[in-house]
């Protein structure tokens, strides 16, 4: 049975580059392409120099100048991504010291609620997003983004931590999710799979896509990421999801070139500064949001996750530039670093559109499930 | 209603100071950055600062930095621009302007108060 | 600096003739695009935010359409009281930055 065609005005159809996304019989998710969901692989970690740092090694995020009106937050830690292995599995991999967090890796003991117990949590992340049960919310208006378009220099920390690909971003990138809801941008890293195997941490309808942008945020209710963790609406991260399309894209192009200097676990180079938002999809005011958590040790909740509807389109030669080029730990390629999906358990996602009507001619309009009842603008 | 009346305007020598006010009502002043936006005689519009909703943190024109100053007092529902050392083309009528709840757009804005500087 | 080009920076239509501005950004802005209506002697008044989304309000003849770098605002069937100088604006990067203005006249 194949997934009916989407249109863009349905849910998840149509990338940046105004394309259709057909899902046929190929894309459907096999069983080896989804992680067991009693052992899944992680996601977000909140590392410094190694991996994640005691409370004490947070650094205080503190105002710059009012001339300059951002906050100092280059040197928070991050939020990041780490592997799904051949067989995913939800166990972290600890060094000899024991109980910290700072040496997980996937397909190891111990399970992961033993480095972290928020990790066996009711509110997890990343979801399998079904837009017909989605709940329309009007009160969920289009997001603003103040600051990404980046100038070349100062140029930017593009680093291999084993996990993920990431890019630390400057002070002054601001995000607005809607009143009471600011945030600064921290960094943003990807999520892929391997050859011929998609990537993404979120799916819909249990269509796994073949990879996964996020951009992290930090609450400006909070100075300091230990200070948000676990605290709702405390962090907030934008997603969406890379699919393969005709043409180069030329925003990925400048990140991906850079994925060679980088092979080797815990290396880094540095990035000329780039447009940001033109790593996201265009339409700003269509998406799914929901109250989940980071997806790797110490999986803390409370992390609001947008998910664009729109897809980001990426050329097959950078895909597999992305899947193909990084190594993680122990000598194995660092692949198919997303977490399984984890269970809703009775969480509601909520649409900024009507995402349960579907387009496609072939389907009886849904019955809306769920409901938002907060007003519009 | 939301209103926003500004003051403070008049006619002052170049090198001179003046200080705006902007109060606001009809709404909860304290969870709205606020911004002062510029409109010389006969031309367009200019945004000049802007202040996040605590007053922690605030932007600036390049022309008007190290010369400006944006400031709110929350309790007293007010906004304010003090500008100091004031050149010619500082001519305008300066009007006051909230952005949208948790937003970055501008959704209203005061009459506005003009500010002359000319020796 | 993010420079808004906003054209024509004059227009005489007719009542009930439809109206197209735009607005042209030096550089991606996404759609942090707003536009603004100034009548002669009085504030801007808001239309339109996030490029395509209008304020409650204001009338559905408003319609504000692009993304990226071109914009467009139009009023489909244009009123006496339509009247006015109208602004597109940036907050997509600082400095904020408007567009020089388009002053729409009735023949």
């Known amino acids: 049975q194949r997934l009916p065609r989407m249109q863009e005005d349905s849910p998840l159809g149509g990338g940046s580059s105004g394309e259709d996304d057909p899902l046929g019989e190929e894309d459907l998710p096999s069983e080896e392409d989804s992680p067991r969901e009693e052992d899944p692989p992680g996601e977000e970690d909140l590392p410094g120099e190694e991996d994640l740092p005691g409370e004490e090694d947070l650094p205080e995020v503190k105002p710059k100048s009012e001339e300059e009106g951002s906050l100092k937050l280059e040197d928070l830690p991050t939020v990041e991504a780490p592997g799904d292995p051949q067989e995913p599995q939800n166990n972290a991999h600890r060094d000899k010291e024991g109980d910290d967090q700072s040496h997980w890796r996937y397909g190891g003991d111990p399970p992961w609620p033993r480095v972290s117990p928020a990790c066996a949590g009711r509110f997890q992340s990343p979801v399998d997003i079904r837009p017909q049960l989605a709940a329309f919310c009007p009160a969920l208006r289009p997001l603003e983004l103040l600051g990404f378009q980046l100038p070349p220099l100062p140029e930017l920390r593009l680093r291999n931590n084993g996990h993920s690909v990431q890019l630390t971003l400057p002070p002054g990138l601001e995000m607005a999710l809607g009143p009471g809801r600011e945030y600064r941008a921290l960094q943003l890293h990807l999520h892929w799979g391997a050859a011929g195997r998609p990537g993404s941490e979120h799916t819909v309808e249990g269509h796994r896509f073949p990879a996964e942008i996020h951009v992290v945020h930090l609450s400006t209710a909070f100075a300091r990421v230990d200070e948000a963790l676990g605290r709702p609406g405390g962090l907030a991260v934008l997603a969406a999801f890379l699919e393969e399309g005709p043409e180069e894209n030329s925003a990925y192009e400048q990140l991906l070139s850079r994925l060679e200097e980088i092979a080797e676990e815990g290396s880094e180079t540095q990035v000329p500064g780039l447009d940001i938002s033109a790593l996201l999809p265009s339409d700003f005011s269509r998406y799914f949001q929901y109250e989940g958590s980071l997806t790797t040790p110490p999986c803390a909740q409370g992390v609001i996750w947008t998910v664009f509807n729109q897809t980001v389109m990426l050329s097959a030669k950078q895909l597999h530039t992305l899947s193909d080029t990084l190594w993680g730990p122990g000598d194995s390629r660092l692949q198919l670093n997303f977490r399984a999906t984890q269970p809703l358990n009775g969480r509601v996602i909520e649409a900024s559109f009507p995402a349960g009507v579907d387009s496609s001619p072939r389907a009886a309009e849904p019955v809306q499930l769920n409901s938002c009842l907060a007003a519009g603008d | 209603e939301v209103q926003l009346v500004e003051s403070g305007g008049g006619l002052v020598k170049p090198g001179g100071s003046l200080r705006l006010s902007c109060a606001a009502s009809?709404?909860?002043?304290?969870?709205?950055?606020m911004s002062w936006v510029r409109q010389a005689p006969g031309k367009g519009l200019e945004w000049v600062a802007a202040?996040?909703?605590?007053?922690?943190?605030?932007y600036y024109l390049d022309t008007v930095k190290g010369r400006f100053t944006i400031s709110r007092d929350n309790a007293k529902n007010t906004l304010y621009l003090q500008m100091n050392s004031l050149r010619a083309e500082d001519t305008a009528l300066y009007y006051c302007?909230?952005?949208?709840?948790?937003?970055?757009?501008?959704?209203?804005w005061g009459q506005g108060t003009l500010v002359t500087v000319s020796s | 600096d993010i420079q808004m080009t906003q054209s024509p920076s004059s227009l005489s239509a007719s009542v009930g003739d439809r109206v197209t501005i735009t607005c042209k950004a030096s550089?991606?802005?996404?759609?942090?695009v707003a536009w603004y209506q100034q009548k002669p002697g009085q504030a801007p008044r808001r239309l339109i935010y996030?490029?395509?989304n209008r304020y409650t309000g204001v009338p559905d003849r408003f319609s504000g359409s692009g993304s990226g770098t071109d914009f467009t605002l139009t009023i489909s069937s244009l009123q006496a009281e339509d009247l006015a100088d109208y602004y597109c604006?940036?907050?997509?990067?600082?400095?904020?930055?408007f567009g020089g203005g388009t002053k729409v006249e009735i023949k």
């Open positions: 604006q940036q907050y997509s990067n600082y400095p904020w930055t």
């Open positions: 202040i996040n909703s605590d007053g922690g943190i605030t």
């Open positions: 996030s490029a395509s």
């Open positions: 302007a909230r952005h949208r709840s948790g937003y970055f757009s501008m959704d209203y």
């Open positions: 550089q991606n802005v996404v759609s942090a």
């Open positions: 009809g709404f909860t002043f304290s969870n709205y950055y």
